[in-house]
Amino acid sequence: EEELQVIQPDKSISVAAGESATLHCTVTSLIPVGPIQWFRGAGPGRELIYNQKEGHFPRVTTVSDLTKRNNMDFSIRISNITPADAGTYYCVKFRKGSPDDVEFKSGAGTELSVRAKPSAPVVSGPAARATPQHTVSFTCESHGFSPRDITLKWFKNGNELSDFQTNVDPAGDSVSYSIHSTAKVVLTREDVHSQVICEVAHVTLQGDPLRGTANLSETIRVPPTLEVTQQPVRAENQVNVTCQVRKFYPQRLQLTWLENGNVSRTETASTLTENKDGTYNWMSWLLVNVSAHRDDVKLTCQVEHDGQPAVSKSHDLKVSAHPKEQGSNTAPGPALASAAPL
């Protein structure tokens, strides 16, 4: 009779994580007497996967009925495959012996590669907000995928970005891999509604890439523009001065009025109006009793936005005598004049 051969017909197989892997093995003879064992890897450090002779292998089942003497099929099925199961599996025939069974012949091996989906990409932006015209970095991370080949793209509002660097780790063979990418984005004043998207494509995703997003609203700070204007006289000796706070983001804003450098009133922004671009406007007004002032009045609108150093805009009210208005019973009072805002 010809000497026994161990045949592993599949040089390699690829299995999706969570599925079962069937490793095929047949022998060509019933002799010598002795068990079949399956190992992962070769050499002294090889890992026993299944032993026909003894042991408990809860994830392994035999494809054929090994209690049938004329069975020559020693294929096994490993359930619930994970990336850690990747490797080369050898079907090995042993000859009954003592003190240990003697390895008689090994199959050529079957390489099992595990297709594992990448985790959902997580995009994170800078810890602190930045203002338009500044460049900020975003990172994207995804883990646990196999095989190593993967494609990562960055988009800002649907437009692909080109300024990014990507690393896949580890560089050598591994059961699974991670990807890390950093993209640079230049902020504009219109970016409150903008999104940065990291898109990951992998063989396991069957053409349906995974996306992670970051809203630039978490990253951007648009500082306000201020305009102080004097409104027409409301009453004989009262002037209404308004401070227009425009195009700011985020909402957190505190405004202080100063009359000749002295705090007149402080208020926190509320009932804001939102612009189409996602920024906000707010208006504060101050009624100034001119008769209470002998000299010119310097009114300052001081705004502290999102914890940043205050910005301010001033307006000079000139106090001067003016004739009594016709039809008015009020006594002559100072005339009002406004200087251009500072």
Partner: antibody
Framework: EVQLVESGGGLVQPGGSLRLSCAAS????????MHWVRQAPGKGLEWVSA???????YYTGSVKGRFTISRENAKNSLYLQMNSLRAADTAVYYC????????????WGQGTMVTVSS | DIQMTQSPSSLSASVGDRVTITCRAS??????AAWFQQKPGKAPKSLIY???SLHSGVPSKFSGSGSGTDFTLTISSLQPEDFATYYC?????????FGQGTKLEIK
């Protein structure tokens, strides 16, 4: 049902011959290593002979050259040809099937008695 | 040839007892040790192979252990039908050899 039935035992004079048969049913005999085991009256078990699936044969020292094990696949039967019989060969002879992969004995026949006496 | 030495040669026990029979091989036999039960006038019955694996249909009160040279057969709770003679065997290499037997009797 898997079964082994021995026959051919009996009384024989020293120096005589006897041929034991073992008819197998429920399995293909040629796919298994097959054995003969004997038990002298009031004594323990003694392995006598075996035939492998490739036709390879094995004997215990005391019967070498006198006993021959064989099989006939067409009849699904095992045989033990015993020549030059001695009084010490007096025993119940059992036909035994070796296990699937390690040759552990799993199925025993009911035995046939061989008496060697003048 | 590999010698198999069983002890004790005979053993008296009561129903419900737990009993252990030991077998020592004259040289290492890996775990190719088997155990058989034989009742008077009957053919032996296979109980255990590869030291600890139970043959199909054998009740779990029988258990085997050991590797190398020392092996044990344990019956966890004796029943009347368990009183018989028990044999160990090595089947790692020819000639296969048996122990001399242990006769288990009712006390």
């Amino acid at each position: 049902e898997v079964q082994l039935v021995e026959s051919g035992g009996g009384l024989v004079q020293p120096g005589g011959s006897l041929r034991l048969s073992c008819a197998a049913s429920g399995f293909t005999l040629s796919s298994y290593d097959m054995h003969w085991v004997r038990q002298a009256p009031g004594k323990g078990l003694e392995w006598v002979s075996a035939i492998g699936t490739a036709g390879d044969t094995y004997y215990t020292g005391s019967v070498k050259g006198r006993f021959t094990i064989s099989r006939e696949n067409a009849k699904n039967s095992l045989y033990l040809q015993m020549n030059s019989l001695r009084a010490a060969d007096t025993a119940v002879y059992y036909c035994v099937r070796g296990g699937v992969w390690d040759d552990a004995f799993d199925i025993w026949g009911q035995g046939t008695m061989v008496t060697v006496s003048s | 040839d590999i010698q198999m030495t069983q002890s004790p040669s005979s053993l008296s026990a009561s129903v419900g007892d737990r009993v252990t029979i030991t077998c020592r091989a004259s040289q290492g036999i890996n775990n190719y040790a088997a155990w058989f039960q034989q009742k008077p006038g009957k053919a032996p019955k296979s109980l255990i192979y590869t030291a600890s694996s139970l043959h199909s249909g054998v009740p779990s009160k029988f258990s085997g252990s050991g590797s190398g040279t020392d092996f044990t057969l344990t019956i966890s709770s004796l029943q009347p039908e368990d009183f018989a003679t028990y044999y160990c065997q090595q089947y790692v290499s020819y000639p296969y050899t048996f122990g001399q037997g242990t006769k288990l009797e009712i006390k």
